[in-house]
């Protein structure tokens, strides 16, 4: 086994001066690194585990159904082949693809996570990290497109569809990154006194890095619709003192204060309690962090099935869309753009709209 | 300073239960895994089993499984371990033995209560 | 389970004697090996760990070294402190296992 010289001390244990070469276990069994994590690896079936199990499955069906629709309506209606609704599919696909990766784990946890090789519960931990960043920055790409539109005063950027694709592969460039990092090298193979309680194979300092990275995402995405509504707010209350239609335009702040309340509130609530909890499996040695994880994991899995019902059913044409792809429809005219065509922007990006121009056709 | 501090000695029937206690003090108790060992008069050193605090984790040694049960109270800070079905191959001085790392298990251990006599005897 | 192996079973030496005590592995165990010392109606106590890593506080006149199956523990020039017996012990994962134990003694 190779053997990397180093004479850093062991900071997880002050009291002695450690001058050992740190060794690598790739070829132990994952029992090994469990054991030595603290982290229970069960040996049979409990309530718990089953019903991780069960729900996580139902959870994962859901995920993969909800985003196949999301995909197909706006591939079918070409009323949505606009930036937006490009960012949203791939949102879809990200959120598909975590599906995918909960599935798997789905299939690879409890007892079955001890037939695991080290290489296999990397790809196992690989796929959710991949698929989780891939979901995020989406939602950051979102975050930024509306951002965007409306400081620009558009109802959809005049992005090119190159540069579309451009920001899809560097969304998934980035997750594919992020989900490769410990497998090729930030993980605790070959510094086993600093493995993680959470995921035994993950180096604490991985875990305080992904946590961080996350929460900054958040906190960027925050700021950012902060100050969509800001915007919005000072143009509403500008143009209330010149306009007769003072209640459109708080119906219009509500409804834009709804959304945004919605997006980021799924966010905060399906992301935060697991982020928190990764900083306190390495920050806070009294906290029993495993006893709460499957359900953060869980939770945050919610968020992938959350975006399509935040993102998507909020829409009135893409509700139709599914209803037609659903019921087997025909669309009356799903390829040309109609008369009101423009009112297929998203509910944020029309009621932004409304609130600053006095009818929603003035720009494209 | 870190201590472990074991219950006084036990004298009971065969097939009768005890229960030893282990106060630790000194530092945080659910940072750190708790051991047991036993040790039988002029012989070696055997392990029984581990809990881990923080998680309530517990580890047995095979052939200890259905003769020791370890328990752990942390608001008082305390491990306990429950011998049943007590033989006289039980009679031994029993060690609780503290974890030398903290937040992880390195299944060496470098703070050790003073021993728990137990006798069985009818 | 990994069986201990520890040679000799006893030992008597003088003080300012060198003194080797070994240890086998039944397999492969890699650096995680622990040395114990235990006087009479004491508890163990923790000399060495990683093979090689001295416990803070004892003496640099102890020194563990090897790795796999094959460890061992070196005193140089005893102390009267240093007799009794000595145990090792793997740390590899549960369950665990000490060896039979080296009994040191004042020649």
């Known amino acids: 086994m190779a053997a990397i010289s180093t004479s850093i001390p062991v900071i997880s244990q002050p009291q002695f001066t450690a001058m050992n070469e740190p060794q690598c276990f790739y070829n132990e069994s994952i029992a090994f690194f469990y054991n030595r994590s603290g982290k229970h690896l069960a040996t049979e079936w409990n309530t718990v585990s089953k019903l991780v199990m069960g729900l996580g499955i139902t959870v994962c069906i859901f995920i993969m159904l909800a985003n196949l629709l999301v995909m197909v309506a706006i591939y079918v209606n070409r009323r949505f082949h606009f930036p937006i609704y490009y960012l949203m599919a791939n949102l879809a696909a990200a959120d598909f693809f975590a599906g995918l990766a909960y599935f798997y784990l789905m299939f690879n946890t409890g007892p079955n996570t001890r037939r695991l090789t080290v290489s296999t519960w990397l790809l196992r931990q690989g796929l959710i990290d991949t698929s989780l960043t891939a979901s995020v920055a989406n939602l950051l790409a979102i975050a930024i497109e509306r951002h965007i539109t409306v400081f620009r005063m558009q109802l959809h950027t005049r992005m090119s569809n190159r540069r579309v694709v451009v920001v899809i592969v560097v969304i998934w460039t980035m997750a594919i990154v992020m989900g490769a990092i410990p497998s090729v090298g930030w993980n605790c193979i070959c510094d086993i006194e600093n493995c993680s309680n959470m995921a035994p194979l993950y180096s604490d300092s991985y875990l305080v890095f992904w946590a961080i990275f996350n929460l900054v995402t958040f906190v960027v995405m925050v700021v950012l619709y902060a100050h969509i509504f800001g915007y919005v707010r000072q143009r509403t209350m500008r143009m209330s003192r010149h306009s007769s239609g003072p209640r459109r335009n708080r119906d219009t702040m509500m409804s834009l204060l709804k959304t945004v309340v919605i997006v980021l509130g799924a966010f905060i609530i399906c992301w935060t309690p697991g982020l928190v909890l990764l900083l306190l499996d390495v920050c806070c040695p009294q906290c029993d962090v495993l006893a709460y994880e499957k359900f953060f994991l869980l939770l945050a899995e919610f968020n992938s099935a959350m975006n399509p019902i935040i993102y998507s059913y909020r829409d009135k044409e893409m509700s139709a869309t599914f209803r037609q792809i659903l019921c087997c429809q025909r669309s009356e005219n799903p390829t040309g753009p109609t008369e009101g065509s423009d009112r297929s922007a998203s509910s944020l990006n029309h009621t932004i709209l409304a609130g600053v121009h006095s009818n929603d056709h003035s720009v494209v | 300073q870190v201590q472990l501090q074991q219950s006084g000695a036990e004298l009971a029937r065969p097939g009768a239960s005890v229960k030893l206690s282990c106060k630790a003090s000194?530092?945080?108790?659910?940072?750190?895994?708790i051991s047991w060992v036993k040790q039988r008069t002029g012989q070696g050193l055997e392990w029984i089993g581990e809990?881990?605090?923080?998680?309530?984790?517990?580890y047995y040694n095979e052939k200890f499984k259905g003769k020791a049960t370890l328990t752990a109270d942390k608001s008082s800070s305390t491990a306990y371990m429950e011998l049943r079905s007590l033989t006289s191959e039980d009679s031994a001085v029993y060690f609780c033995?503290?974890?030398?790392?903290?937040?992880?298990?390195?299944?060496?251990?470098?703070?050790w209560g003073t021993g728990t006599t137990v006798t069985v005897s009818s | 389970d990994i069986h201990m192996t520890q040679s000799p079973a006893s030992l008597s030496a003088s003080v300012g004697e060198t003194v080797t005590i070994t240890c086998r592995a039944s397999?492969?165990?890699?650096?995680?090996l622990a040395w114990y010392q235990q006087k009479q109606g004491k508890s163990p106590h923790l000399v060495v760990y990683n093979a090689k890593t001295l416990t803070e506080g004892v003496p640099s006149r102890f020194s563990g070294s090897g790795s796999g199956t094959h460890f061992s523990l070196k005193i140089n020039s005893l102390q009267p402190e240093d007799f009794g017996i000595y145990y090792c012990?793997?740390?590899?994962?549960?369950?665990?296992?000490f060896g039979a134990g080296t009994k040191l003694e004042l020649k």
């Open positions: 809990i881990y605090p923080r998680s309530g984790n517990t």
């Open positions: 397999e492969n165990i890699y650096s995680f």
């Open positions: 033995a503290r974890e030398s790392i903290s937040r992880r298990l390195g299944w060496n251990f470098d703070v």
């Open positions: 012990q793997h740390h590899y994962g549960p369950p665990l296992t």
């Open positions: 000194g530092y945080t108790f659910t940072s750190y895994g």
